[in-house]
């Protein structure tokens, strides 16, 4: 700030002092600040301490606070779907039907036309439309990973309902390590949580695109609604304009 | 806004406007709008109406944005902590120890002593103290719910480590439900997450507190740094304040 | 919260979410977005009185403190607090797009 | 981001976080608080300038209306972004308490 | 810095055939658009037609006095812009010139032209 | 088609004059309306785009107005280098439709 704005400086730079003095003494709802008359002397006791940085130090797994959006957020966002390969694909005999689990795979051909950088990438939903469910159901979803193993994504606690909902898992770290590899067909997994010592595992839950025997015309509108991948990215071209003036002001 | 304000208020309104109009065609990079020339006549496609609404509709599991703070976070929260309830207590006999589940129990005496009433906390995180790690291990949080069943709280993926680290998992819903019921002990539960197919459900992280034939000096470090619970409530004197000025602005 | 639900249905003269409903062919003169017609894009209006000075009577500064200047600003501002994305549906020649365009609704407003 | 990485190291002179570290004793005069003794609080300043005018060169004004005017104010304001929280220590009477307080310190800023 | 730079244009019979060349340099060609418009001697500017971007699927339209007779077509990989013309009349005798266009319903750059002159 | 008529035709005027050119569209074009300069033996030039907007690179001395069916193109100061022919375009429907051309001229 050029040099007849030093006062200035200094005039807010007094004005926030003192506005902290309010802010701290407000925030503790106190009028004035507390007698020191009592305090013991000495250190402060070691419990104290050790409370005082258990607050301070921040944790894994504790949420800090939300960081502030990239300058790439603030553009709008192009969004696309990529509906799940239909259920008669060969891919899906690979994978036994089993009772606690239904298999979902993506063409990944069609992810690249829609995103054809994997940085161009901003989010990534799962979505799924559930229909009516009697019980309370806990379920997790997965990735395929490699041949035959799965990787575990997030869960979700699913409450019992009498009309169809939909649901969203934000999938945008797998589909962008997709968008990086090679593969044709890349493929999520829903199950039921199992504990451990629990033997209950059916997933009871009914998704929509996976239920056979409909009639016709029924079909098509399940087709429709069958899980898809709502895709938000940022236009090719708006990216590369982007990439030109980030180190502009 | 007073009358002699309006002419304020529709200027101010003019100028929003004529921002809006900048920040739409800014955010799109467009340096003027598209022109119609070539839109197809008639109504918009099946398909893309159909992509509008999902992106329209916010569905269940998506984040919505942040809620903003409510006046209550405004004013200070006192710190408390809370530990676990030590492994030779006879509570820990009634679960017999296996090999993908810790157990983790607080007299909630202890914790309606820090927080006297339920809706003064405003977070509670349950804090363990992994030791070192040699592979990665998904475990799972669960509360003690009923008789002899555990209700999932929430999981966490635990990379290999070569030091101690402290974990957080935010309770704040859990303990506010211990202030309000009357028992004397509740519980967590740390288990191995356990897959349907799986069957390698031993839990390989060391917590410490946990670890038994200590010399008798390093116990104690160890019992320090056992699983607690940090508190942040409003102090109840402040919270009287706050009510009774709830209604005031 | 200074929110829809608070600011729309009272006379505050403070800082507030204030009404305000864009309809792009009329006030825009914009024909381009095919959906939607228009938003509640509203917007943040109302002073925040500096309240701390060393001579005020400080137990009435406290009780306004957090409202008019939480952020102990040396200039406090009335200004979004939460925002919400806005959908659109607009074409590029002959080809049809949807794009989200992120923080374009104010919901509630802060003095900050 | 217009946060303490950019702004403490650049001369900017628009909307920036600027560096203030709070000294309890010497700029407060308080002995009360007894852990931290001070801490960095930093503040916002710079103009946000209104660049939206239907005549100016529509290039240019794209270029920088995500910096200066994201949310589309009528009078944007330099305000905060990203904030923490400072835990304190300090004694009622004979007893020791560890408090929280919220939203102490500026780490970034925003045109709003 | 964008550059169109039209060639192909001479003297052709009636009812004769030639095509004309537009090399572009300075920007991502799959990008954009790309035009031609005419303008006769000592008369105004007339748009022919255009050939869309990638994302339009690279697909032309013209204007009604070109259609059927005039073709535009686009080389990526040479960064160039065609113009077939066929069955010419001497009302085509003009200055050929291959312009940018934008969305917004504009043409940003301009070539410097090509004359074509149809006489018997 | 739409139809675009300029006036007037040609116009002669000092430097350091201001001048105003007209176009006339046969309907309602939404502020489509574009601008070129045409000077002899050089390329055609866009000015203003989108019925105000300046190109980039072009002198502010050059701004455009109007709305519906009505526009204007000003030259707050006249300069020996205006001499030229301009063109106005409407971009709202196709085809793509210019006016017949203004030539401008140095008294």
């Known amino acids: 700030l050029s040099t007849c704005k030093t006062i200035d400086m200094e005039l807010v730079k007094r004005k926030r002092i003192e506005a902290i003095r309010g802010q701290i003494l407000s925030k503790l709802r106190l009028a004035s600040p507390p007698s020191q008359g009592e305090v013991p002397p000495g250190p402060l006791p070691e419990a104290v301490l050790a409370l005082y940085n258990s607050t301070r130090d921040r944790v894994a797994g504790e949420s800090a606070e939300p960081e502030p959006e990239p300058e790439a957020d603030y553009y709008a966002k192009e969004v696309t779907r990529v509906l799940m390969v239909e259920t008669h694909n060969e891919i899906y005999d690979k994978f036994k039907q089993s009772t606690h689990s239904i298999y979902m795979f993506f063409n990944t051909s069609e992810l690249r036309e829609a995103v054809p950088e994997p940085v161009l990438l901003s989010r990534a939903e799962l979505r799924l439309l559930r229909l009516k469910l009697k019980v309370e159901q806990h379920v997790e979803l997965y990735q395929k990973y490699s041949n035959n193993s799965w990787r575990y994504l997030s869960n979700r606690l699913l409450a019992p309902s009498d009309s169809p909902e939909w649901l969203s898992f934000d999938v945008t770290g797998v589909v962008r390590q997709w968008l990086s590899r090679g593969g044709e067909i890349e493929g999520f997994r829903l199950s039921a949580h199992c504990s451990c010592d629990s033997r209950d595992n059916t997933l009871q839950v009914d998704i929509n695109g996976f239920t056979t025997g409909r009639r016709g015309d029924l079909a098509t509108i399940h087709g429709m609604n069958r899980p898809f991948l709502l895709l938000m990215a940022t236009p090719l071209e708006r990216a590369q304009h982007l990439q030109s003036s980030r180190h502009r002001r | 806004l007073s009358t002699c304000k309006t002419i304020d208020m529709e200027l101010v309104k003019r100028k929003r406007i004529e921002a809006i109009r900048g920040q739409i065609l800014s955010k799109l990079r467009l340096a003027s709008p598209p022109s119609q020339g070539e839109v197809p006549p008639g109504p918009l496609p099946e398909a893309v109406l159909a992509l509008y609404n999902s992106t329209r509709d916010r569905v269940a599991g998506e984040s919505a944005e942040p809620e903003p703070e409510p006046e209550a976070d405004y004013y200070a929260k006192e710190v408390t902590r809370v530990l676990m309830v030590e492994t030779h207590n006879e509570i820990y006999d009634k679960f017999k120890q296996s090999t993908h589940s810790i157990y983790m129990f607080f007299n909630t005496s202890e914790l309606r002593e820090a927080v006297p009433e339920p809706v003064l906390l405003s977070r509670a995180e349950l804090r363990l103290l992994r030791l070192k790690l040699k592979v990665e291990q998904h475990v799972e949080l669960y509360q003690k719910y009923s008789n002899n069943s555990w209700r999932y709280l929430s999981n966490r993926l635990l990379a290999p480590s070569d030091s101690p680290e402290w974990l957080s998992f935010d309770v704040t819903g859990v303990v506010r439900q211990w202030l309000s019921r009357g028992g004397e002990i509740e519980g967590f539960r740390l288990s191995a997450h356990c897959s349907c197919d799986s069957r390698d459900n031993t839990l390989q992280v060391d917590i410490n507190g946990f670890t038994t034939g200590r010399r008798g000096d390093l116990a104690t470090i160890h019992g320090m740094n056992r699983p607690f619970l940090l508190l942040m409530a409003t102090p109840l004197e402040r919270a009287q304040h706050l009510q009774s000025s709830r209604h005031r602005r | 919260a200074l929110d829809t639900n608070y600011c729309f249905s009272s006379t505050e003269k403070n800082c507030c979410v204030r009404q305000l409903y864009i309809d792009f062919r009329k006030d825009l003169g914009w024909k381009w977005i095919h959906e939607p017609k228009g938003y509640h894009a509203n917007f943040c209006l109302g002073p925040c009185p500096y309240i701390w000075s060393l001579d005020t009577q400080y137990s009435k500064v406290l009780a306004l403190y957090n409202q008019h200047n939480p952020g102990a600003s040396a200039a406090p501002c009335c200004v979004p607090q939460a925002l919400e994305p806005l959908p659109i549906v607009y074409y590029v020649g002959r080809k049809p797009k949807v794009e989200q365009l992120s923080n374009m609704i104010v919901r509630s407003c802060k003095c900050s | 981001a217009l946060d303490t990485n950019y702004c403490f190291s650049s001369t900017e002179k628009n909307c920036c976080v600027r560096q203030l570290y709070i000294d309890f004793r010497k700029d407060l005069g308080w002995k009360w608080i007894h852990e931290p003794k001070g801490y960095h609080a930093n503040f916002c300043l710079g103009p946000c300038p209104y660049i939206w005018s239907l005549d100016t060169q529509y290039s240019k004004v794209l270029a920088l209306y995500n910096q200066h005017n994201p949310g589309a104010s009528a009078a944007p304001c330099c305000v905060p972004q990203a904030l923490e929280p400072l835990p304190i220590v300090y004694y009622v009477g004979r007893k020791p308490k560890v408090e929280q307080l919220s939203n102490m310190i500026v780490r970034s800023c925003k045109c709003s | 810095e964008v550059q169109l730079v039209e060639s192909g244009g001479g003297l052709v019979q009636p009812g004769g055939s030639l095509r004309l060349s537009c090399a572009a340099s300075?920007?991502?060609?799959?990008?954009?658009?790309m035009s031609w418009v005419r303008q006769a001697p000592g008369k105004g500017l007339e748009w022919l037609g255009f050939?869309?971007?990638?994302?339009?699927?690279?697909?032309?339209e013209y204007s009604a006095s070109v259609k059927g007779r005039f073709t535009i077509s686009r080389d990526n990989s040479q960064n160039s812009l065609y113009l077939q013309m066929n069955s010419l009349k001497t009302e085509d005798t003009a200055v050929y010139y291959c312009a940018r266009y934008t969305g917004g319903g504009y043409f940003d750059y301009w070539g410097q032209g090509t004359l074509l002159t149809v006489s018997s | 088609d739409i139809q675009m008529t300029q006036s007037p035709s040609s116009l002669s005027a000092s430097v350091g004059d201001r001048l105003t050119i007209s176009c006339r569209a046969s309907q309602d074009i939404s502020n489509y309306l574009n601008w070129y300069q045409q000077k002899p033996g050089k390329v055609v030039k866009l000015l203003i785009y989108?019925?105000?907007r300046l190109h980039s690179g072009v002198p502010s001395r050059f701004s455009g107005s109007g709305s519906g069916t009505d526009y204007t193109l000003t030259i707050s100061s006249l300069q020996p280098e205006d001499v030229a022919t301009y063109f106005c375009q409407q971009g709202d429907t196709l085809p793509w439709t210019f006016g017949q051309g203004t030539k401008l001229e140095i008294k």
């Open positions: 050939i869309r971007n990638k994302p339009n699927g690279y697909t032309t």
């Open positions: 300075g920007f991502t060609f799959t990008d954009y658009y």
């Open positions: 989108y019925t105000s």
